[in-house]
Interface confidence: low
Amino acid sequence: GVTSAPDTRPAPGSTAPPAHGVTSAPDTRPAPGSTAPPAHGVTSAPDTRPAPGSTAPPAHGVTSAPDTRPAPGSTAPPAHGVTSAPDTRPAPGSTAPPAH
């Protein structure tokens, strides 16, 4: 893992999510704006939380506020599919929508 890198998170608009395991990658959480969001079932997607909404929509509390976390633990679990991807946090706001 990355242990000697700076403790900041990547800024939006970077060309790729941080390459974890590479010692020059920052010790941070990726910000929105990378090249692609997590795609379900696509093994080259980052090692991220898969996007709920494939098999069932997120049945979670907050629905009217776009930039809020739907509360987990409700009726629909996140749809899982990205299993072998590399280790980065998802980079939202990118060019391709999640493949549901």
């Epitope: 959480r29 090692d47 909404g53 987990p72 999640p98």
Partner: antibody, heavy 128, light 112 residues
């Protein structure tokens, strides 16, 4: 239901080792980032270590760096903390914690980065 | 590291009355993505912590609406509009904007 159960705590002498385990159930373990967070007796919370969902990215608090190693076995739905060169100041309840980072929907992704599931903890006592 | 400072250390409250807890960070918690990853946790006696609020003001699933969060940048507040007996415990703020993840020292809410 979603559950995290820690084990492996106990009494150990300074300089000794322990391996903590955390058994996860009720959710897809391999999709979640996990952390160990500890709480010394009568004190506040201290983040110890973090591991990404596939286990390739690991971060540590300075206080444990070089002594503790976090790992996971997604096939066994388990998280581990190998603790070496233990010191009296490592005495604490150790919590296994799930971190949820966000979701994507309709081409947009949303982040929240929060610790939403906590185990009941396992107690580590370092004393001669 | 980001230092999280909570006040007061202890807050004796009368049942049914409001309570307010302040949390100040040593630097801005605004992430480069525009979000502020500030959470509040409750720890009842003898129990593990429980998530109450995330991203400053969003109540987590199942959290009563008497709990609310507010603030921006470096200054944040957790309010309990009407304290109930089950609210007794220690409350922690936590930042997840930057590693290492850090917590406030805690505020003990007790009944007068």
């Amino acid at each position: 239901q979603v559950q995290l159960v820690e084990s492996g705590g106990g009494l150990v002498k300074p300089g000794g080792s322990l391996r903590l385990s955390c058994a996860a159930s009720g959710f897809i373990f391999s999709d979640y980032y996990m952390s160990w967070i500890r709480q010394a007796p009568g004190k506040g919370l201290e983040w110890v270590s973090y591991i990404s969902s596939s286990g390739t990215t690991k971060y540590y608090a300075d206080s444990v760096k070089g002594r503790f190693t976090i790992s996971r076995d997604n096939a066994k739905n388990s998280l581990y903390l190998q603790m070496n060169s233990l010191r009296a100041e490592d005495t604490a309840v150790y919590y296994c914690v799930r971190e949820d980072i966000g979701y994507c929907s309709g081409g947009s992704c949303f982040y929240y980065y929060y610790m939403d599931v906590w185990g009941k903890g396992t107690t580590v006592t370092v004393s001669s | 590291d980001i230092v999280m400072t909570q006040t007061p250390l202890s807050s004796p409250v009368t049942l049914g009355q409001p309570a307010s807890i302040s949390c100040r960070s040593s630097q801005s918690l605004v992430h480069s993505d525009g979000n502020t990853y500030l959470s509040w946790l409750q720890q009842r006696p003898g129990q593990p912590p429980r998530l109450l609020i995330y991203k400053i003001s969003n109540r987590f699933s199942g959290v009563p609406d008497r709990f609310s969060g507010s603030g921006a940048g470096t200054d944040f507040t957790l309010k309990i509009s009407r304290v109930e007996a089950e609210d007794v415990g220690v409350y922690y703020c936590m930042q997840a904007t930057q590693f290492p993840l850090t917590f406030g020292g805690g505020t003990k809410v007790e009944i007068k």
